[in-house]
Interface confidence: low
C-alpha cells in the first residue's frame, strides 16, 4: 500500500477518506488505527458500529469519529481539534473475524496555525481592532466545543 498524506491545521478538523470496493468488503466493519513505529502493531482508535447495517452512524472516541458509507464504499474519519501529537501513521482497516485488511495507509501531518504571526496580546492582524466590528449572526446553531478546544484559527 502506498501512503496517502492528509494535511490538517492545528485546532481545525481534518477529514480522512478511505475508498474501498463496497462489494469486496460487504458486511465488514471498519476501523481506524494508529501505527506504533514502522513495524509495530496498529493500535485501534475507533471502529464502526457493531451492527454493520448501522455503520453510517458516526461513532466517536475522544476527538476522533468514524462513519462508513457502505454502499458508496467510502470510510470517513474525522479528527477534531487537530493537535501536533495527532501527527503520524494510521491505517483504515476492514475487519473480518480476528483479521484486518488494510484499506489505506495514511500519514497525518499537522500544520501550524497559519495566523500565528500575532504577538501575544495582539489581535488577528495588526489592523484588526479597527477592521473588525460586531457581526450579526442569523439563527446561529453550531456544535458545542469541548472545554479548552480552540477551533481554527485560535485567538490570542
Amino acid at each position: 500500500h502506498n501512503t496517502t498524506v492528509f494535511q490538517g491545521v492545528a485546532g481545525q478538523s481534518l477529514q480522512v477518506s478511505c475508498p474501498y470496493d463496497s462489494m469486496k468488503h460487504w458486511g465488514r466493519r471498519k476501523a481506524w488505527c494508529r501505527q506504533l513505529g514502522e513495524k509495530g502493531p496498529c493500535q485501534r482508535v475507533v471502529s464502526t458500529h457493531n451492527l454493520w447495517l448501522l455503520s453510517f452512524l458516526r461513532r466517536w472516541n475522544g476527538s476522533t469519529a468514524i462513519t462508513d458509507d457502505t454502499l458508496g464504499g467510502t470510510l470517513t474519519i474525522t479528527l477534531r481539534n487537530l493537535q501536533p501529537h495527532d501527527a503520524g501513521l494510521y491505517q483504515c482497516q476492514s475487519l473480518h473475524g480476528s483479521e484486518a485488511d488494510t484499506l489505506r495507509k495514511v500519514l497525518v501531518e499537522v500544520l501550524a496555525d497559519p495566523l500565528d504571526h500575532r504577538d501575544a496580546g495582539d489581535l488577528w492582524f495588526p489592523g484588526e481592532s479597527e477592521s473588525f466590528e460586531d457581526a450579526h449572526v442569523e439563527h446561529s446553531i453550531s456544535r458545542s466545543l469541548l472545554e479548552g478546544e480552540i477551533p481554527f484559527p485560535p485567538t490570542s
Epitope: 484588526e128 484559527p153 485560535p154
Partner: antibody, heavy 118, light 112 residues
Framework: EVQLVESGGGLVQPGGSLRLSCAAS????????MSWVRQAPGKGLEWVSV??????????GYNPSVKGRFTISRDNSKNTLYLQMNSLRAEDTAVYYC?????????WGQGTLVTVSS | DIVMTQSPDSLAVSLGERATINCQSS???????????LNWYQQKPGQPPKLLIY???TRASGVPDRFSGSGSGTDFTLTISSLQAEDVAVYYC?????????FGQGTKVEIK
C-alpha cells in the same frame, strides 16, 4: 469534499441593494473564517470582507471601499454565508466569490456576477 | 494599505521552459517569527482562483512541484520550472500580513 456555491447575483440599478448567498459543505463551517473576494470584468482580485469563526464571536471585517455599505453574515444552522450589499455603485460590478480562509483563500466558489447599471 | 506590484503583466514561454513571475510589496511581509506572509494564486480562464503557494514558499496541497516560490521581505518570485499546457493562466500574488488583504494586478502566462 469542500464545496462553496454562490447565488443571488444579478442586475441592479445604482443605489440599489442585493443579497448574495454562499452555501458551504464538506467541512465544519463554524470552525472557519469565511470571506468574499470580488473580480471586476477583465480585472484583478479585490478582497471585500471576512467574518470570523465561532471562537471569535463571528465578528466581521471589511475593505474600506465597501465599509458602511456591505454587511457580511453567516447562518451556521444552514452552513451559509451572506453578503448584503446596499447603496451599490457601478464600480461594484464584479464576479463575487465566496472563499474559505486558512493559510490564504484555500477554497473558492465559482462566483456570482453582480452588475450595477442603469 | 500594502501595495502589491507584479511584473511582467504578461509572459509567453515555450512548453517545457522556465517561467518566472515577480511580485513586489510596498512593505516587508517578513514577520519576526521568520515567516513571510505572501501567497500565490493561479486563475485559469472561466475558473475561480486556486491557492498555489503560502508563506512565500510552501506549496498548497496537491500543487505540482514544478511550482516554487521564493524571495525576501519585499521581493518575491513564482517559478514554473517546466511550463505545461495546463499552466496557462493568470497568476496573482497576495499579502496576508495585514488588513486589507491586497493582491497584485496579475500576470498572464501563455504558451510561446
Amino acid at each position: 469534499e469542500v464545496q462553496l456555491v454562490e447565488s443571488g447575483g444579478g442586475l441592479v440599478q445604482p443605489g440599489g441593494s442585493l443579497r448574495l448567498s454562499c452555501a458551504a459543505s464538506g467541512f465544519t463551517f463554524t470552525d472557519f473564517y469565511m470571506s468574499w473576494v470580488r473580480q471586476a470584468p477583465g480585472k484583478g482580485l479585490e478582497w471585500v470582507s471576512v467574518i470570523r469563526n465561532k471562537a471569535n464571536a463571528y465578528t466581521a471585517g471589511y475593505n474600506p471601499s465597501v465599509k458602511g455599505r456591505f454587511t457580511i453574515s453567516r447562518d451556521n444552522s444552514k452552513n451559509t454565508l451572506y453578503l448584503q450589499m446596499n447603496s451599490l455603485r457601478a464600480e461594484d460590478t464584479a464576479v463575487y466569490y465566496c472563499a474559505r480562509l486558512t493559510y490564504g483563500f484555500d477554497y473558492w466558489g465559482q462566483g456570482t456576477l453582480v452588475t450595477v447599471s442603469s | 494599505d500594502i501595495v502589491m506590484t507584479q511584473s511582467p503583466d504578461s509572459l509567453a514561454v515555450s512548453l517545457g521552459e522556465r517561467a518566472t513571475i515577480n511580485c513586489q510589496s510596498s512593505k516587508s511581509l517578513l514577520h519576526s517569527n521568520g515567516k513571510t506572509y505572501l501567497n500565490w494564486y493561479q486563475q485559469k480562464p472561466g475558473q475561480p482562483p486556486k491557492l498555489l503557494i503560502y508563506w512565500m514558499s510552501t506549496r498548497a496541497s496537491g500543487v505540482p512541484d514544478r511550482f516554487s516560490g521564493s524571495g525576501s521581505g519585499t521581493d518575491f518570485t513564482l517559478t514554473i520550472s517546466s511550463l505545461q499546457a495546463e499552466d496557462v493562466a493568470v497568476y496573482y500574488c497576495q499579502q496576508f500580513l495585514e488588513f486589507p488583504f491586497t493582491f497584485g494586478q496579475g500576470t498572464k502566462v501563455e504558451i510561446k
